[in-house]
Structure formats: C-alpha cells, structure tokens
C-alpha cells in the first residue's frame, strides 16, 4: 500500500482506567494530513463515535477505559498529499494493584512511573496525564503509600508535586489521581510512581538531561524504517551540541555515501524554565549490520544509547 512503517517504543498501561495515545510525528504531521487509527492490522478503522469505549478523537486514540483485552499493536496511518506513514504502537495492559503490597514488581514500567528526588534539595514529581482536550481532568491528588499527601513540605503545582527539603523518608510508592470527565461520564485516572532518592546533584546548571533513550534495546524487523527521537532537557542559555553518533562518528559522516541512516533536524520546545530538544535518527532501512551496535545520542557531556535487536521468533 506504499506506506512507510515506523515502530514506536512499547507502552505499558493499567487496566480499568482511561488511556490515550496521540499520533503525532513532527516531521510528518506538521502539514495537512489525515490520521486514521487501526488495531492489529485490521482494515476497519477505529470508531470515531465518541460514545464508543475505544474511539479516535482527532489524532488521538482514546480508551474509556482500557481493558485487559485491549493489548496489541495499534497502527495510525498518516496520509499527506505525497506521503503515507504507518506508525505501530505496541500497547500492553496489566492489572494495577498500587496499594496491594503482596503483588510483586510491576513489569518494566516506563520512566514516567520511576522518578528520582534529590536528597536535601527542593525537587518535584510529575504526574503524566496525556489526553485529548475533549477530556476535562479534575484536580490532581497525590498519595504516598496509599495515604493522601498533606503537609507543609508539599505543594501541588499543576501536574507537579513540589517537595521541599527532600529526605530519605520521601522514597517509596506514590500515586497521582485525577477524575477525567468525557461526554458527561467520569473515570478515575491513577498513575503509580516509584520514587527513589539520590544524593547526586540534581539537573540544573549546564548538564543536559537525556529523557529518552535510556540505554536500552529496541526490537525492530529487518528492512523496516525506524525513527528514534532523542529528547533532551537543558537550560535556555545552554551552548551544548546534540547529535547522534555511531562508532564515535557522527551518523551523517559514518553513512555519508549511502545516506541510509541520517540525523534529523533538531527542534525544541521552550518550557519557560528550560528547553526540551528533540533530534531524531532515521534508519531508512534496517540492515543486519545495524543490530547490536550502540547508536549514541550525545548532549554536551551526557550520552544515552539504543541498540537494535531482532524480534524473538514467533513459534506459534
């Protein structure tokens, strides 16, 4: 069908609560495009009827709520005048038991659910709530070990929980909760966050923080197109360079002749107190020689890598 396939990182989600995923891909969705969502390579698009439990809302797919059986690979197809891209998103649903201490560790939670506070400093936790604007989110409440957080050291600031003078006792299991209202119906959103404490100096000054990638592997089929973003936060007045390297060489130089792997144009979003930079690496066609190599994102003195690996064979 002439669509280029792009594979996104897996999303691991809680059952019985709302979930939404936005199909935006800055190089593609910035112009006039149409976006259509599908599940598991179905030819039938996801419903756009807002009363449907799973429906498309503009560029979003919205689950009200997510259920156990919703795990699977979802595709959003972005069609422009002269282009077509199919973005694959693997959603894995698990049963959450934030307050049940008998349940073992949660499966490979993303970094949104693992956060760090810096000992002796003033710091903050973030409640990640990603929903379309048709969803109204009620005031966020914060819990630690299943008790609502109160006290002079804590302030709720938008989606953040400010913690002043962080102590070792602040480590533990937190949750942020909000009531989501959509078409007159209400749903609870509850995100569990595992908080650890570090004595190292926090992000600030001129040391950039690489949000993604996180030194991990990505499963990708041979021959597919893959785009990976490097997301970096840094101070507004920074002079750091951000780039992708392989074998200690800039990817654009390393693949100068074939141009098969290229670094994208850097973009940034200004967040008042810092900037969020994005620079991607595009594999036009993944080849055998790409597997096992660390592709490094550099941002000043900070580095993080991805390693491509072949998906495990399916013997079913």
């Amino acid at each position: 069908d002439g669509c280029k396939d792009i594979f996104m990182k897996n999303e691991i989600l809680s059952a019985s609560q709302p979930f939404a995923f936005n199909c935006t891909f800055p190089p593609i969705t910035s112009g006039e495009v149409s976006v259509t969502w599908y599940k598991n390579s179905s030819k039938i698009p996801v419903s756009k009827i807002i009363q449907s439990r799973i429906h498309q809302d503009e560029t979003w797919i919205l689950f009200l709520p997510m259920e156990w059986g919703d795990s699977g690979v979802y595709q959003c197809v972005i069609k422009g005048r002269d282009s077509c891209h199919r973005i694959h998103v693997n959603l894995t649903v698990f049963e959450k038991h934030w307050c049940d201490t008998s349940i073992g560790g949660l499966p490979n939670l993303s970094d949104e659910y693992k956060q760090i506070l810096h000992l002796g400093k003033d710091d903050s936790l973030t409640c990640h709530l990603h929903f379309p604007k048709s969803c109204v989110l009620g005031p966020i409440k914060w819990y630690k070990d299943c008790n609502e957080i109160k006290g002079e050291r804590f302030t709720v600031l938008e989606t953040r929980l400010l913690v002043s003078n962080v102590s070792a006792e602040d480590r533990g299991n937190y949750a942020c909760q909000a009531i989501l209202t959509h078409s007159g119906k209400q749903y609870e959103v509850l995100n569990g966050i595992t908080v650890s404490i570090t004595e190292r100096a926090g992000y600030g000054g001129s040391v950039p923080k690489i949000i993604y990638p996180k030194n991990h592997s990505i499963e990708v089929q041979l021959g597919t197109t893959l785009i990976v973003d490097c997301n970096v936060t840094d101070t507004k007045d920074n002079t750091n360079l951000r780039c992708w390297r392989v074998n200690n060489t800039l990817v654009d130089d390393y693949y100068d002749e074939s141009k098969r792997i290229r670094e994208g144009v850097e973009t940034h979003v200004s967040f008042r107190e810092h900037n969020l930079y994005t620079v991607n690496i595009t594999f036009l066609e993944v080849k055998m020689e790409d597997y096992g190599l660390p592709f490094m994102c550099h941002a000043g003195v900070s580095t993080a890598y991805i390693i491509l690996q072949l998906p495990a064979p399916d013997f079913r």
Epitope: E158, T159, D237, R272, H274
Partner: antibody, heavy 117, light 107 residues
Framework: DLQFQESGPGLVKPSQTLSLTCTVT?????????WNWIRQPPGKGLEWIGY???????NYNPSLKSRVTITRDTSKNQFSLKLSSVTAADTAVYFC??????????WGQGTLVTVSS | DIQMTQSPSSLSASVGDRVTITCRAS??????LNWYQQKPGKAPKLLIY???MLHSGVPSRFSPSGSGNDYTFTISSLQPEDIATYYC?????????FGGGTKVEIK
C-alpha cells in the same frame, strides 16, 4: 506550602525607580520554574512584567523592557523588581507569582504602589 | 503580542444559572490557555490550566473547553461565592498576555 510576600515602598515619586522584593517560602527559587512579576492598575486588567528563571535568566515584556530589571538573592530566596523612570501610569498593585509549565499557579497577595509627587 | 479578547466584559445572572465566558486569541496558542478568578482586593487564583485541567481545590461546576484560537469557560450552576472577575491568559508565546476580564454579578 509555597508562599509569597511582596514588600517595598507604597509611594514613589515620578521619574524615580520603583523597587519591590518578593520573598518566597516553601520552595527554592533555584530549584525550578520561572518567578514572575505581574501588575494591575486600579480597576483595570492584568499585565505580565517579566520573570527570572531558576537558572537566573530573565525575560521581560517588550512594552516595559527598557525600564525593567529583575534580579534575585538566592541566599534569602528572594527576587526583586526595579522599574525606572516611573510615571502615574505605573500606579498599580504589583504581584509576584510562580509559573508552572503552563500557568501562574500561585500568587502573592499583591502590594499597591502609587506614583505621585 | 497575542491579543486575548474576552466576552462578555460583564454579566449578571441568578444563582443556579449556567454562565459561559469566551476567550479568543489573535493567534494559535496550542491549548496554552488558563483561567483565573479574582475577587475584589485579592490576588487572582488559578482555576484552569492548559485548556482543560482543573487546579487543586477547584469545584467541578467549573468546566472548560476549546482549542486553536477559541476557548470557553462555563459555570454550570452559579453560586454566590462565584461572584468575581474572570480572566483568561495565554501561555504559548512571550509576552504572556491576559484577556480584559469578565465581571460576574448576581441578579
């Protein structure tokens, strides 16, 4: 809890410099976020003046930029506003406020500054 | 600068009435739209941030919507304590700017 207290003279003569300080308790101004000054002339709307960020960089409203300076004293967890060459049009209630990622989330109670000879 | 046009500039309604205030931005503000409530002699208080998120302690009768350039703010059932001036504010592009305000009174 995060709290703000504005302080400074309530009366300033025309052509002089207005100076105000905002004392923050409950969170370090060097930890994160942008720390703002906003004003409201009597019976009128709100005008953003400028901010100093946690890293010390500043940004000012272009309409006031030539007259505004925002500084900070990290040892006292304070940030300050200086507005030079004031006129009667600068008579206003001046607020300090923290800006989260999206909004002016918490404000001081404000202090009225009157410009008059 | 982005101009924020709020309407109406004032309104009078009865307790229990549904009240709607609109705010139009002169440019696209990508949902970076906030609403504040200010009572006489007090500092403004944040009610809603980023178009559709209610701030801590804000009752559910305050309900926002909108996107692009046009945003609305509804009080589903007006209460005596809602008597105040309401401001919209864009946080997308510096300098950050406010609407002219809507004064809400009880009939």
């Amino acid at each position: 809890d995060l709290q703000f207290q504005e302080s400074g003279p309530g009366l300033v003569k025309p052509s002089q410099t207005l100076s105000l300080t905002c004392t923050v308790t409950g969170y370090s101004i060097t930890a994160d976020f942008a720390w703002n000054w906003i004003r409201q002339p009597p019976g009128k709307g709100l005008e953003w003046i400028g901010y100093i960020s946690y890293s010390g960089d500043t940004n000012y409203n272009p309409s006031l930029k030539s007259r505004v300076t925002i500084t900070r004293d990290t040892s006292k967890n304070q940030f300050s506003l200086k507005l030079s060459s004031v006129t009667a049009a600068d008579t206003a209630v001046y607020f300090c406020a923290i800006r989260g990622p999206y909004s002016f989330t918490y404000w001081g109670q404000g202090t009225l500054v009157t410009v008059s000879s | 600068d982005i101009q924020m046009t709020q309407s109406p500039s004032s309104l009078s309604a009865s307790v229990g009435d549904r009240v709607t205030i609109t705010c139009r931005a002169s440019q696209w503000i990508n949902n970076y739209l906030n609403w504040y409530q200010q009572k006489p002699g007090k500092a403004p208080k944040l009610l809603i941030y980023y178009t559709s998120m209610l701030h801590s302690g804000v009752p559910s009768r305050f309900s926002p919507s909108g996107s692009g350039n046009d945003y609305t703010f509804t009080i589903s059932s007006l209460q005596p304590e809602d008597i105040a001036t309401y401001y919209c504010q864009q946080g997308h592009t510096l300098p950050w700017t406010f609407g002219g305000g809507t004064k809400v009174e009880i009939k």
